[in-house]
Amino acid sequence: MAVTACQGLGFVVSLIGIAGIIAATCMDQWSTQDLYNNPVTAVFNYQGLWRSCVRESSGFTECRGYFTLLGLPAMLQAVRALMIVGIVLGAIGLLVSIFALKCIRIGSMEDSAKANMTLTSGIMFIVSGLCAIAGVSVFANMLVTNFWMSTANMYTGMGGMVQTVQTRYTFGAALFVGWVAGGLTLIGGVMMCIACRGLAPEETNYKAVSYHASGHSVAYKPGGFKASTGFGSNTKNKKIYDGGARTEDEVQSYPSKHDYV
């Protein structure tokens, strides 16, 4: 019962986490204009992974997509890639974990197979969560670096009469959504891995019983039914991993498609 609860909770937590990763990836507010210690402007700038937006005090918002792939900073491309890999792995993990749930019966699937699938999805969730956390952290680091660079620029080269408003960017809501979502996916993955241990049947250690047949002395030793732990060459698992690799390759072209929408 505890195993089912742990597995179910892990699935739900991961589901929320992956939904959050998707939301964060799509959000426009990865970086927002820093309002502290700046002139109060009648426009508010904010940027996402896919487009930048300007909200005017009049209420009008204008967003522009990054209609270039090669012209974008390598770090932004890396963040996009990490987030997409996280989403893809998470989505495959969710698909696998649905079939692995103890409360769902599919034909005559053995507990050992469910344990393998639970472990596979757990690992996928962990990697997915780590990808999201890494992506958000890389972007945050990029922001911090740029923030201090633009702050330095604000206090240099002001000798002329004309002043230029230096737009500085700080952490946007998407970063916090991404961190929390990545953390939840990671926790969900760990829970799935813990549930896997409970799902795998233990090795049954019956005491050897001797049956004395007339004329012969033959000893039968029942036992030795070892459950597959998922580290062996399980063809079902192999298919899932292959599928994952293929999907990941297909997604590599996704940012460019998105850019030219």
């Epitope: 005090s57 009049s58 004309v162």
Partner: antibody, heavy 117, light 113 residues
Framework: QVQLKESGPGLVKPSETLSLTCTVS????????ISWVRQPPGKGLEWLGE???????NYNSALKSRVSISKDNSKSQVFLKLSSVQAADTARYYC???????????WGQGTLVTVSS | DIVMTQSPDSLTVSLGERATINCKSS????????????LTWYQQKPGQPPKLLIY???TRESGVPDRFTGSGSGTDFTLTISSLQAEDVAVYYC?????????FGPGTKLEIK
């Protein structure tokens, strides 16, 4: 058809509070922000402040302690209050609708307010 | 506060001739987020409220004749009337729409020679 109309007393005594109302039609205050601008006779335009769709405001720092803008979305009305008025506050007061680029695309005809005892 | 200056204070031009009004701001009105200049031009005729001509420094408001052209970036802006008409006699104001308070220029009075 978009229309804005300012209304209020034409004469206000010094040190009193000037209260004006801008009644709009043809659009909703939940979709557009409104700005107040004044023009002393024979002089240029002076921005007083604005009220955004959500109810947030921003005022001219020179008048910040004296000016207040509010609105009633259901009545399609925006209110301007200017306290402790002096003769220098004598002007034609306009309300305008904010549009692209924070520009004012529609203006009221304005209401002339004279501060005199 | 941003100080807006306009030149000349008054301008006399013959009908059909080109009229040029300049506006200068003490700070850049260029928003890096969308590369747009938040400067607006208004026309005010005697006894009337101001009328919007140009926003974003160069975008003509719908219904405004195409003889009105806005140009410039950063701190220096220009309003050009390519062929002056009798109905263009008015006072022209530029406005900073970028940094609060949203200050206006002192105005340029355009008259016919």
């Amino acid at each position: 058809q978009v229309q804005l109309k300012e209304s209020g007393p034409g004469l206000v005594k010094p040190s009193e509070t000037l209260s004006l109302t801008c009644t709009v039609s043809g659009f909703s205050l939940t979709s557009y922000a409104i700005s107040w601008v004044r023009q002393p006779p024979g002089k240029g335009l002076e921005w007083l402040g604005e009220i955004w769709t959500g109810g947030g405001t921003n005022y001219n720092s020179a008048l910040k302690s004296r000016v207040s803008i509010s609105k009633d979305n259901s009545k399609s009305q925006v209110f301007l209050k200017l306290s402790s008025v002096q003769a220098a506050d004598t002007a034609r007061y306009y309300c305008g609708r904010l549009s692209y680029g924070n520009s004012l695309d529609y203006w009221g005809q304005g209401t002339l307010v004279t501060v005199s005892s | 506060d941003i100080v807006m200056t306009q030149s000349p204070d008054s301008l006399t031009v013959s009908l059909g001739e080109r009229a040029t009004i300049n506006c200068k701001s003490s700070q850049s009105l260029l928003n890096s987020g969308n590369q747009k200049n938040y400067l607006t031009w208004y026309q005010q005729k005697p006894g009337q409220p101001p009328k919007l001509l140009i926003y974003w420094a160069s975008t003509r408001e719908s219904g405004v004749p195409d003889r009105f052209t806005g140009s410039g970036s950063g701190t220096d802006f220009t309003l050009t009337i390519s062929s002056l008409q009798a109905e263009d006699v008015a006072v022209y104001y530029c406005q900073n729409n970028f940094i609060y308070p949203l200050t206006f220029g002192p105005g340029t009075k355009l008259e016919i020679k």
